[in-house]
């Protein structure tokens, strides 16, 4: 007697008769910009503060008539599914409402714009709590839009956006596309990505997660108790809005960055059917329906890392792609990946005092992506050493050198535009795991951390004959912070985490020949920090 | 996600401050650039959003808006100031015709200007 | 089948508070499909709602009498109550208890009062 | 709030005569309207709910139509155990029942 969405992001132990997480959320304000609202909804009535904040085009058609009940159908139902008495994830959170969208669900980039200036304004009026913004709107990409979502997330508030009804690349829509908001894609009662009519869930890498987004009962204007099923990824949105106001209202404290870190990390785990997306979005979309933390406590003590991956370089011959982490993380590893395999690797450089990732593209080459591993690492001191093409038969390499230093990731760049096609691969000398081993005609970049208690180790896996994918894994309570392929494989297309899985990439193997030069092996960095374990245990 | 340079259509006008005789003229080798939605239907041309350097105060903003109001009408053009952003982004909501962009792309404190373009439920 | 039977004094004095119970049977009163319902009716007068709770105790009441009622519940005693304060002779009625289908799982039933108690007459007298 | 006005408030029949009774929303409550019988001494009991759905166990002979602002209960022909008060009651915002009508033999 539960509907499916809220038991799908109900973790097992929560389980035993009906939706029982505690009345979560009830520190946080959600502020919903969308219609205007039914507030005396017996699902909202009570909990939904009705702003005065109204900023919205008149209706198109000469004969549009405005029924209330249809104007206020969208946010009802939203506001719903995020804190709804009944059918709501967050049932304790209070929401405040400003009107944005029309009564046909229309509105602008400049309306939209006021209200977050809005919202701005209010929080510096009256700090409360954390603050969480719903936006379930998406228009074309917009660089004012995605600037003051910026804005406002470096100012605290943790902004959740629909990734779109498109069927499309979610970058190419905002705030979806704003990379400080958390964009959230639409999945069914089969975990399969949502088909709305001829069109559908966005996805791509500007996609942070998917969560439920069809057939998702809410609050239904149409009268004061009534329910009606919707879906979208206003929908979804609206679930990741909830999610997050039960954890802030659990760990008041928690960072933007945080908080993103711990929804990837709870949701659930390649149950996706990736088939659906587009061949050449299915690597950059992640894998994730979101899901509420098995306890409200607890989740600090381990090391959190996410994957984020550039915007594609594009296929001339010097381009190159950069992808970045957010403020609050450390880019703890770098690596690239080309559909062709054409490329001249990567490096971690200084851009405005951070550390980015950089993927070099090859002549001839249709472009790279850039792919960094971000992680949250509390006083961590990070450094890249880099060691230029080595003359030496042995290859190049290079080690973590300063005390107390561990080896988090490894990269190499090389200028020349076929590495290693008639050259044999190099092989690691054995005991030696906390240094890159690389091509002797590549730089190989170190990535070196210092921070309280982080250990790690390297893990491989080869796999002697030719084949499209060679993926290793860190085992249970380490975390992947690098990724990479051991040099001397010509055909690899490139290398880059999946959770907690190192994932190398081949050329089709039908094309590639079963010589020396198919051995693939997969390296993977795991860390953990005892630091973060004990401080946990501590708090406990 | 989107980097600001992303994948969507940007007009730059790379335009020389000769006209006015501007008193705070662009810094040089600065230009201002501007932006529309890439969705032609999504467009509100009329509407456009004046985003001003990050570190220019409300009053600053103001005084930009008009000066473009002023010369604008110089030019036989009316305008609106419909909005004065401040506290997330410094800058103006301006309703003014298209051949004003240029004029309005030569102000001080002026990054970029954006045409106001539909958002939509989902 | 569910059946719901009101308890509770027949008098209280004017000013004071008026307290009644509703015990349910041949069902749960912890399932989120159901809301359960307090409904009076004056002699010889219409029917008014007073107010509704879910197993989750959480509330919502008839905006004219908000500020006087409070609706309870004891999953546990599968019982659920209605305190009135400040009672004058208006609020003289025969009080009902009430199921009301929540409206989530519609495979519930419809969303109305069903079934109802056999009520209870309270008079508010001196 | 919205006022429910039902009419006539008695109306004398017969048994195996045709009842119809009527009631009027202060504003559009759409379909969200239901009807229900009540007896001497009893408590109130669902007839019809959604305008037009009959609960369960409900005889065939009553039926209700309506939506918007007018609505109306119809029992083809009188039972003799169906002379009692009517009243609709609406859910489009909150709940308020009508004033009742009685049905009563002629």
């Known amino acids: 007697s539960i509907p499916w969405n809220l038991e799908r992001i109900t973790p097992p132990r929560y389980r035993a008769d009906e939706y029982q997480p505690p009345d979560g959320g009830s520190l946080v304000e959600v502020y919903l910009l969308d219609t205007s609202i039914q507030s005396d909804h017996r699902e909202i009535e009570g909990r939904v503060m009705v702003t005065d904040f109204e900023n919205v085009p008149e209706e198109d058609g000469t004969r549009f008539h405005r029924q209330a009940s249809k104007c206020d159908s969208h946010g009802t139902h939203l506001a719903g599914v995020v804190s709804g008495r009944d059918a709501g994830v967050a049932k304790g959170a209070s929401m405040r409402s400003l009107r944005v969208l029309n009564c046909q669900g229309k509105g602008t980039v400049s309306g939209t714009l006021i209200g977050l200036e809005f919202i701005r304004k209010s929080q510096l009026v009256q700090p409360v709590g954390p603050l969480v913004v719903l936006l379930p709107l998406a228009g074309g990409y917009s660089r004012v839009l995605n600037a003051a979502c910026q804005r406002l997330a470096r100012a605290g508030v943790v902004l959740v956006t629909a990734a779109g009804n498109f069927r499309d690349d979610a970058c190419l829509y905002s705030p979806a596309s704003a990379p400080e908001v958390i964009t959230v894609g639409a999945t069914n009662a089969q975990d399969q990505p949502v088909t709305l009519g001829t069109l559908g869930t966005n996805f791509g890498r500007c996609v942070d997660l998917f969560a439920p987004g069809e057939d998702i009962i809410g609050a239904s204007s149409d009268c004061s108790t009534c329910f009606v099923s919707q879906s979208g990824t206003s929908q979804a949105a609206a679930h990741v809005a909830g999610i997050a106001a039960m954890m802030l209202s659990a760990e008041p404290e928690l960072t933007l960055a945080e908080l993103r870190q711990r929804l990837i990390h709870f949701s659930a785990k390649d149950v996706i059917n990736e088939a659906w997306f587009p061949e050449d979005q299915r690597v950059l979309t992640p894998n994730l329906v979101a899901a509420l933390p098995p306890s409200t406590h607890g989740a600090g003590w381990q090391l959190f890392c996410r994957t984020v991956w550039s915007a594609h370089s594009g296929p001339t011959r010097m381009a190159t792609a950069v992808a970045r982490c957010a403020p609050d993380e450390e880019l703890l590893s770098c690596s690239s990946f080309s559909r062709s395999g054409k490329r001249r690797g990567e490096r971690m450089e200084a851009q405005g005092g951070k550390l980015v990732c950089r993927a070099h593209n090859a002549f001839g080459g249709e472009g790279v992506y850039a792919i960094a591993r971000c992680c949250l690492l509390p006083q961590a001191n990070c450094s890249v050493h880099t060691a230029p093409p080595a003359e030496a038969s042995m290859g190049t390499r290079v080690h973590c050198h300063q005390q107390g230093h561990v080896l988090t990731g490894c990269s190499s760049h090389w200028e020349v535009e076929d590495l290693g096609t008639h050259k044999p691969p190099v092989l690691r000398p054995r005991g030696q795991p906390n240094q890159c081993v690389g091509h002797r005609e590549a730089s190989i970049h170190a990535s070196c951390c210092h921070a309280p208690g982080l250990e790690c180790k390297v893990k491989e896996h080869g796999i002697p004959a030719p084949q499209e994918q060679v993926t290793v894994a860190c085992e249970e309570g380490w975390t992947l912070t690098g990724c990479s392929a051991l040099p001397g494989t010509s055909h690899v297309l490139g290398a880059y985490a999946v959770d907690n899985t190192c994932v190398v990439r081949s050329r089709d193997v039908s094309t590639t020949g079963s010589t020396s030069e198919g051995a693939v092996t997969a390296v993977a960095i795991c860390c953990r920090s005892r630091h973060l374990a004990q401080a946990s245990q501590e708090l406990q | 996600q989107e980097d600001e340079d992303g994948d969507y259509e940007e007009l730059v006008l790379a335009l020389r401050s000769e006209e006015d005789g501007l008193a705070e003229a662009p810094e040089h080798g600065t230009t201002a650039t501007f932006h529309r939605c890439a969705k032609d239907p999504w467009r509100l041309p009329g509407t456009y959003v004046v985003v001003l350097k990050e570190e220019t105060h409300l009053s600053q903003s103001e005084r930009t808006a008009r000066r473009l109001q002023a010369q604008a009408a110089r030019r036989g053009y009316l305008t609106k100031i419909l909005h004065v952003f401040h506290g997330l982004l410094p800058g103006f909501l301006v309703k003014m015709s298209g051949d004003l962009l240029e004029l309005a792309l030569k102000l001080p404190h002026v990054d970029y200007i954006e045409e106001d373009s539909s958002v939509f439920a989902q | 089948q569910l059946q719901l039977q009101e308890s509770g004094p027949g008098l209280v004095k004017p000013s004071e508070t008026l307290s009644l119970t509703c015990t349910v049977s041949g069902g749960s009163i912890g399932s989120s499909s159901y809301y359960w319902a307090w409904i009076r009716q004056p002699p010889g007068k219409g029917l008014e709602w007073i107010g509704s709770i879910n197993y989750r105790g959480s509330t919502y009441y008839n905006p004219s009498l908000k500020s006087r009622v409070t609706i309870s519940v004891d999953t546990s005693k599968n019982q659920f109550s209605l305190k009135l304060s400040s009672v004058t002779a208006a609020d003289t009625a025969v009080y009902y208890c009430a199921r009301e289908n929540s409206g989530v799982v519609p495979a519930a039933g419809p969303n109305w009062f069903d079934p109802w108690g056999q009520g209870t007459l309270v008079t508010v007298s001196s | 709030e919205i006022v429910l006005t039902q009419s006539p408030a008695t109306l004398s029949l017969s048994p195996g005569e045709r009842a119809t009774l009527s009631c009027r929303a202060s504003?559009?409550?759409?379909?969200?309207l239901a009807w229900y019988q009540q007896k001497p001494g009893q408590a109130p009991r669902l007839l019809i709910y959604d305008a037009s759905n009959r609960a369960t166990g409900i005889p065939a002979r009553f039926s209700g139509s309506g939506s918007g602002t007018d609505f109306t209960l119809t029992i083809s022909s009188l039972e003799p155990e169906d002379f009692a008060v009517y009243y609709c009651q609406q859910r489009r915002n909150w709940f308020t029942f009508g004033g009742g009508t009685k049905v009563e033999i002629k």
């Open positions: 504003q559009s409550v759409s379909s969200y």
